[in-house]
């Protein structure tokens, strides 16, 4: 899963895979995230060490177990790669470092009036990776206002020195802010000349291009296809650069494909991951694990969840299959690319999606695998439909959960709006796991319309359902996508794999939790539920869930959130957390609004004037 915590005054011992100089721990963490083997890092700020050679040292580390022993080191900062952290994965680094000179090859000097202008020049220069700017108060007059554009073999400074009146930073090309623009064309049967900066094996030219885009020194590439005449060069992706930034020559060549890095694209960069699956192809590499799974997509998910896994092969050989499950070979290599690519096999291969920061645009989530009393922490992307409904009055606080059911629709409980019907005070946070990650800069959705069921009455348990129309539609990502809704006439009388999620209290007289909690709760029949609540009417439009002995339940703050069940292989929104007697009490199940009973109402309210459904259900 995604681990974001930093460890102050701690240094991971051993496991080194690379080292470099970086201006701070955050940049070090980013380099770790994009390094194919790095899981952990340790950074030594200038203040933490007397050894001048190790100041600003960034040490990238790997570990078979995913952890390393921590030793105390004053001033050191350590942490985890952000692989698997979705939207936190970015190569963009905007910070300016004052009093620091980042050394490298100075290839361009010009006079500018500000450090921002210097950064802009770097961003608009195809070869510039980082820069230094001498301010107007620099001690040598002839260097004042100098903007030095720089590069280095690894894309990071060759040294970092403390120097007064100098400011340094990185190109914003990885932020998709370059004015250069990019060449999207792929040139068939054409080979580029110039300097090779790296050589990797890839299944196609598009993977080659993405690797080039995120390689610090690749400006263009040539890919040799799997029918290239020289067998040892098949599937070779040559990453290239030149002094001018463009190929000095190109040669017509059968079965080669060439193209350019997309790092200079404006507004959008390709994701730093490869989602395509390659049928009939085997990827060779170091064996990490072999597991039996059902289908190539599950194999890819398994690889993605296993943080060290870089790529996989799913074998369909009869000897590798039993029943409907076949062997999923999870693999890795030094550079993150296969060491061998074989065609015409009975396998399908692909890459881990651990560096993906967005998911597909599928209409409802089928592939995922309260505070809640008796629950456990959820992980990133586990419940991507879960939203937090927060109220901002004098302070801001989480009040209820909700479920994303479409680009512009959230389903929740009507009672969440008791006494707070004003849409302007609500903020809806989606795609989050930790409430503590919410800052004033965290994007949120505002409410365009609150639609409370017409038969709901305050302080009654019936028809506890409400729809929220968001002011603007949300994009779907791995961490923010909708839950499938049931059909009106759901055939399943009792679901057998149901979960409740939320940030609510962990005990009756508790407090809102930071990390989204999950709990597996069995449904109970309405007849059984009615026996436990003799003072209330349990209607057919309600569904109950809970353990006879109690101990696991939804609680205050979970209201409006989802009760989801896996039904015939797909997750469905079965209930909306509504009410119960206390929390997790013995023989007092939680009561949920039964979504299937309100499907006509949901569709009626979410359909626009042209009769097309604006809400997304499984499609």
């Amino acid at each position: 899963g995604c681990l974001t915590q930093l460890y102050e005054n701690a240094f991971f011992r051993g496991g080194d895979v690379a080292s470099m100089y970086t201006p701070n721990a955050q940049y070090c963490q980013m380099r770790c995230t994009f390094h194919p083997r790095c899981l952990l890092f340790s950074f030594l700020p200038a203040s933490s060490i007397n050894d001048m050679e190790k100041r600003f040292g960034c040490f990238l580390k790997d570990s078979v177990t995913g952890t390393l022993p921590k030793v105390h080191r004053t001033g050191a900062v350590s942490g985890h790669s952000l692989k698997q952290c979705g939207h936190q994965i970015s190569a963009c680094h905007r910070d300016i470092y004052k009093g620091v000179d980042m050394r490298g090859v100075n290839f361009n000097v010009s006079k500018v009036s500000s450090v921002e202008e210097c950064q802009k020049r770097c961003t608009s220069n195809i070869r510039c990776q980082f820069f230094s700017y001498a301010t107007q108060t620099f001690h040598k007059a002839e260097y004042r206002n100098n903007c030095l554009l720089k590069y280095s073999p690894g894309g990071t400074p060759t040294a970092i020195k403390v120097l007064s009146n100098v400011e340094s930073g990185f190109s914003l090309k990885p932020c998709a802010l370059s004015e250069i623009g990019c060449h999207m064309n792929i040139f068939q049967h054409l080979a580029f000349s110039d300097v090779d900066v790296a050589r990797v094996l890839t299944p196609d030219a598009f993977v080659c291009r993405t690797i080039c885009t995120y390689h610090p020194n690749c400006l263009f590439f040539t890919f040799y296809t799997n029918v290239w005449k020289i067998e040892s060069q098949r599937n070779v992706c040559l990453l290239k650069t030149s002094e001018s930034g463009t190929p000095s020559s190109s040669t017509p060549q059968e079965n080669t494909i060439s193209g350019y890095s997309l790092l200079t694209c404006k507004r959008t960069l390709p994701e730093p991951c490869h989602s395509k699956i390659y049928p009939g192809v085997d990827f060779g590499g170091e064996e990490l694990n072999v597991t039996f799974v059902k289908g190539v997509n599950v194999c890819q998910e398994t690889c993605t969840k296993m943080i060290r896994c870089q790529f996989f092969t799913y074998s369909l050989l009869p000897e590798d299959c039993k029943e409907e499950k076949c062997k999923c070979f999870l693999r890795l290599s030094m550079d993150g690319s296969p060491t061998r690519i074989a065609y015409g096999t009975q396998g399908s291969s692909g890459y881990s999606l651990r560096l993906c920061n967005t998911g597909d645009n599928s209409v409802c989530t089928t592939k995922t695998s309260t505070r809640i009393v008796g629950g456990t922490n959820s992980s990133w992307g586990e419940w991507p439909w879960q939203v937090s409904l927060q109220v901002k009055l004098t302070a801001q606080r989480h009040l209820c959960g909700g479920s994303l059911i479409g680009h512009q629709w959230v389903l929740t409980a009507a009672h969440c709006f008791d006494g707070l019907p004003l849409q302007d005070v609500w903020r809806i946070y989606s795609g989050i796991l930790n409430l503590s990650d919410i800052t004033k800069d965290t994007p949120f959705s505002q409410i365009k319309e609150i639609i409370i069921h017409q038969n709901y009455k305050v302080s009654e348990g019936n028809h506890d359902i409400a729809l929220i129309k968001l002011q603007a539609p949300l994009n779907y990502t791995e961490f923010q996508k909708p839950i499938c809704l049931p059909s009106k006439g759901d055939t399943s009388t009792i679901y057998t794999n149901c979960w409740v999620t939320g940030w609510g209290f962990s005990k009756e007289k508790g407090e809102i939790q930071n990390i989204l909690q999950k709990v597996n709760i069995p449904l109970v029949t309405n007849e059984e539920c009615q026996k436990r609540y003799q003072d209330y009417k349990i209607t057919q439009r309600m569904v109950c869930a809970g353990y006879k002995e109690g101990g696991k339940d939804a609680c205050k703050g979970d209201s409006g959130g989802p009760l989801v069940c896996k039904h015939n292989g797909m997750w469905r929104l079965v209930g909306i957390t509504s009410w119960g007697e206390g929390c997790a009490r013995r023989e007092q199940p939680g009561v949920y609004t039964k979504v299937a009973e309100y499907m006509d109402w949901i569709l009626e309210k979410t359909q626009s004037s042209d009769g097309k459904a604006q809400m997304q259900s499984p499609a």
């Epitope: 399943s492 679901y495 499609a619």
Partner: antibody
């Protein structure tokens, strides 16, 4: 891979009962519903009902007015459909079908039930 | 019960033709519709649905559209193996119901 293997053809007299079996393999039997659909000769498809083996829950098409009983045996991963008070109108190929989501992604090979005096 | 009406009940077409089959529901079924192909002596085969789109292994010449009460199955360029009977099925409300079928024959 998922396989549904049905019992052989049956010939029944009017008023009798028939019990058709469907043995499932290649997946976890208790995780998915099993549905039954029939098709009279040269005609269209008609949904009979379903069972969720994991919970024992059933759902029936009211058209069959209590004549149908669907059961499942977890130990053998087999579902059964029993239809009583047979008439010539019940002559049909009976299919078991396993859904993915709601639609029927996997089908048995079919069992022909002939009702004739 | 929701009635599903398919049209035409049969059609004759040649290889390479574009074929369109329509299915009309007696009430709004949103997008909860599946299409099946059945060849003589065989069980039906799921082609596509509102749940999961085009099934794995189904050629891209098959496509579906519609929402609410009116739905369409299109075969963009009919191939010899496509001559069969096609059924629509709603899974919005039990009992699940099927259209009466459309037989696609060789002209």
């Amino acid at each position: 891979q998922v396989q549904l293997v049905q019992s052989g053809a049956e010939v029944k007299k009017p008023g009798a009962s028939v019990k058709v079996s469907c043995k499932a393999s290649g997946y976890t039997f208790t995780d998915y519903e099993m549905h039954w659909v029939r098709q009279p000769p040269g005609k269209g498809l008609e949904w009979i009902g379903a069972i969720h083996p994991g919970s024992g829950g059933t759902a029936y098409n009211q058209k069959f007015k209590g004549r149908v009983t669907i059961t499942a045996d977890e130990s053998t991963s087999t579902a059964y459909m029993e239809l009583s008070s047979l008439t010539s109108e019940d002559t049909a190929v009976y299919y078991c079908a396993r859904p993915y989501g709601y639609p029927f992604a996997y089908w048995g090979q079919g069992t022909l039930v002939t009702v004739s005096s | 019960d929701i009635q599903m009406t398919q049209s035409p009940s049969s059609l004759s077409a040649s290889v390479g033709d574009r074929v369109t089959i329509t299915c009309k529901a007696s009430e709004d079924i949103y997008n909860r519709l599946a299409w099946y192909q059945q060849k003589p002596g065989q069980a039906p085969r799921l082609l596509m649905s509102g749940e999961t789109g085009l099934e794995a292994g189904v050629p891209s010449r098959f496509s579906g559209s519609g929402s609410g009460t009116d739905f369409t199955l299109t075969i963009s360029s009919l191939q010899p193996e496509d001559f069969a009977t096609y059924y629509c099925q709603q899974y919005w409300s039990t009992p699940w119901t099927f259209g009466q079928g459309t037989k696609v024959e060789i002209k």
